[in-house]
Interface confidence: medium
Amino acid sequence: SIPWNLERITPPRYRADEYQPPDGGSLVEVYLLDTSIQSDHREIEGRVMVTDFENVPEEDGTRFHRQASKCDSHGTHLAGVVSGRDAGVAKGASMRSLRVLNCQGKGTVSGTLIGLEFIRKSQLVQPVGPLVVLLPLAGGYSRVLNAACQRLARAGVVLVTAAGNFRDDACLYSPASAPEVITVGATNAQDQPVTLGTLGTNFGRCVDLFAPGEDIIGASSDCSTCFVSQSGTSQAAAHVAGIAAMMLSAEPELTLAELRQRLIHFSAKDVINEAWFPEDQRVLTPNLVAALPPSTHGAGWQLFCRTVWSAHSGPTRMATAVARCAPDEELLSCSSFSRSGKRRGERMEAQGGKLVCRAHNAFGGEGVYAIARCCLLPQANCSVHTAPPAEASMGTRVHCHQQGHVLTGCSSHWEVEDLGTHKPPVLRPRGQPNQCVGHREASIHASCCHAPGLECKVKEHGIPAPQEQVTVACEEGWTLTGCSALPGTSHVLGAYAVDNTCVVRSRDVSTTGSTSEGAVTAVAICCRSRHLAQASQELQ
Amino acid sequence: QEDEDGDYEELVLALRSEEDGLAEAPEHGTTATFHRCAKDPWRLPGTYVVVLKEETHLSQSERTARRLQAQAARRGYLTKILHVFHGLLPGFLVKMSGDLLELALKLPHVDYIEEDSSVFAQ
């Protein structure tokens, strides 16, 4: 039998025998910034190189006694989880440890920065294969720590960090809040979020995914063959660092954006009980538990997309919220969401040479979120086509008129405070898939893309009676790129993508009344890339 | 005691290497900002990361650090440059009194300053 955590991240095809997936991360070097470690532990002996880097604060308290085994405890366990020969995820990965946490597990932002700089300099002096940096630590939000992580990520390094053990929004902590970092929350054997005393795993939009983080068996620094069970988001992050090492070993050319999309794609979906999270965080927190891909190759044909939520706009009348994709990703659609339902829609706009998704709050609104659908689409050429408010009874419409461009997403934005629930719903003309249709008082924005072999289709699901939630999903082999609601009446709180499903949320049924304008239609745009599929077949 | 002597030695060198009081004003219209940890118990006042603008060279970082030391010395403050950053972010880590923040924010090339803070094993 294998420990629950290794079983959880292992696809069934690997489970027949003891956990021994191919490659084991042997082409990858994992840097660990943590406490000192016991490098002669059987689990990690010969796999972990202890660098001469050390930058730690003095231990607190005059009566503190340094005990080697306690000083090494956290780092040794994590090194074992990543690459331990028996209880590790990536048994072939080699590691390098930097000491940035003292014997009490405490460090400084400045010490961590100097450690990250050390890694960058090592990378420049002696370029090796893919690098993964594991940061199993957290402090308060730090602009400088996030900036350093961004720079290192842009130098081609994959950074994985703990979401934090504060049962709080991960966006309030660093490096968890750095968008370029893969931020990992912790779940237990029952796929529940981990509780740690009165606290527990962090959550929210800054978490990329969850991984096993409770009762994880790993190397103990008590002796060279001892094991101990530890819990926390550090352990969860170590699993993802191991999975990343495995994936990069199989496909060393993967970019950070490709790796993140694959981690999300191969995760177990919708297994976490969201009731554990505060209500306002549930929609923002990804319901994903990390897993290894079922095979090391052959994922290249897939069109990968993920959902990126913005920070909350705040309640002021003109407040806006912006969601951005990573540098290597394409923004294929933009939607918005407001718990109060008071919003003025969203639009895609250029910012610094890249498209971003901006959502607008309305007067009396408690604030909005912008939701970007960010996809990997090589050789894509995307643009936004806008139609101003038509004022015509048929509503506003816009389509992709350029040859070879397909519709990947629709957004609508209005200046009026209330589109009004008493106006008749807009009916969408059938047989025109390349067209966005919206309220006559709204401007409509179509995201139109050209990419080799890209094909898209529109899928709708309408419910005549008012419903709090309407969903429509893309079928197997197709990827959700756009998610919006028809019509854009004010009782719609917004639309957003959850994995391959478009979700349209409406106000509580009891407050809207069951009239004809209560009808809500969820509109999904589903795409696939024949070019990527062909390219992958040719490789095989 | 040894450490203090080192500080004074550094200070004297800094004074000697700077023209008296000729601090360049920061570029017009850009104001450097100060950041600190929102969680009070995690703050580490007295140590600051001075982050310089993106294209700043190592030599400029070192010059800016020395200038800060010189200007601080003229006001009777002791400072210690703990590390000069280059490779990821341009800047330096300095041990100094919080009284000098206003002065430091006006130095040329400064983008922002962040007070050091604690991080913890998770």
């Epitope: 420990p3 002996e45 010969g46 020969r85 209880a87 002796c223 063959t225 | -």
Partner: antibody
């Protein structure tokens, strides 16, 4: 099926030396530590030392330091025990054993059949 | 150094009896204690690891308990094939070494 096969035992003169072999099959040799344990006639088990075939690192019982040398040849999946300056009290059955991992602990899970070494003039 | 003391050194019992063997460590060995069974002329066989976990293929009449310094091996209903010598073994942190108990011989009454 995991198998460990010892060889090299026999009669040795006091002061002499010998090399025992343990051929492993049925698993990845370099992934498991290997131990040597001996048992004098009518007595209990006594640990001699172990080797990590992956790194070649060894650890010995204080009593056998300088007397026993454990080595391995990963290409042959074979473990060795070299014993020097043998005396009558080294007469024993010598076992090799694999150190298996079991959810947070280790144990000598597979043992060879043993090879008898008799030290006598 | 850790010493492992087994008691009794030998015992006589009948088929169907409940048999208990104890093993005491001179220092705390946590749960890192293993039990082996050895029959005459044969190599030892792993019974229990981590103080209480039964090795696969070992009959469920064998059980182990204990932690720290005091451990017990119990055979709930002795079978003819159980007549053998039983050894406990622990890991000595301080020496990075392995220590066996003196053994307990279970004989037919």
């Amino acid at each position: 099926e995991v198998q460990l096969l010892e060889s090299g035992g026999g009669l040795v003169q006091p002061g002499g030396s010998l090399r025992l072999s343990c051929k492993a099959s049925g698993y990845t040799f370099s992934s498991y530590w290997m131990h040597w344990v001996r048992q004098a006639p009518g007595k209990g088990l006594e640990w001699i030392g172990r080797i990590d075939p992956y790194t070649g690192g060894t650890k010995y019982n204080e009593k056998f330091k300088g007397k026993a040398t454990i080595s391995r040849d990963n290409s042959k999946n074979t473990l060795y025990l070299q014993m020097n300056s043998l005396r009558a009290e080294d007469t024993a059955v010598y076992y090799c054993a694999r150190y298996g991992y079991y959810l947070g602990s280790y144990a000598m899970d597979y043992w060879g059949q043993g090879t008898l070494v008799t030290v006598s003039s | 150094d850790i010493q492992m003391t087994q008691s009794p050194s030998s015992l006589s019992a009948s088929v169907g009896d409940r048999v208990t063997i104890t093993c005491r460590a001179s220092q705390d060995v946590s749960r890192y204690l293993t039990w082996y069974q050895q029959k005459p002329g044969k190599a030892p066989k792993l019974l229990i690891y981590a103080a209480s976990s039964l090795q696969s293929g070992v009959p469920s009449r064998f059980s182990g308990s204990g932690s720290g310094t005091d451990f017990t091996l119990t055979i709930s209903s002795l079978q003819p094939e159980d007549f053998a010598t039983y050894y406990c073994q622990a890991y000595d942190y301080s020496l990075s070494g392995y220590v066996f108990g003196g053994g307990t011989k279970v004989e037919i009454k």
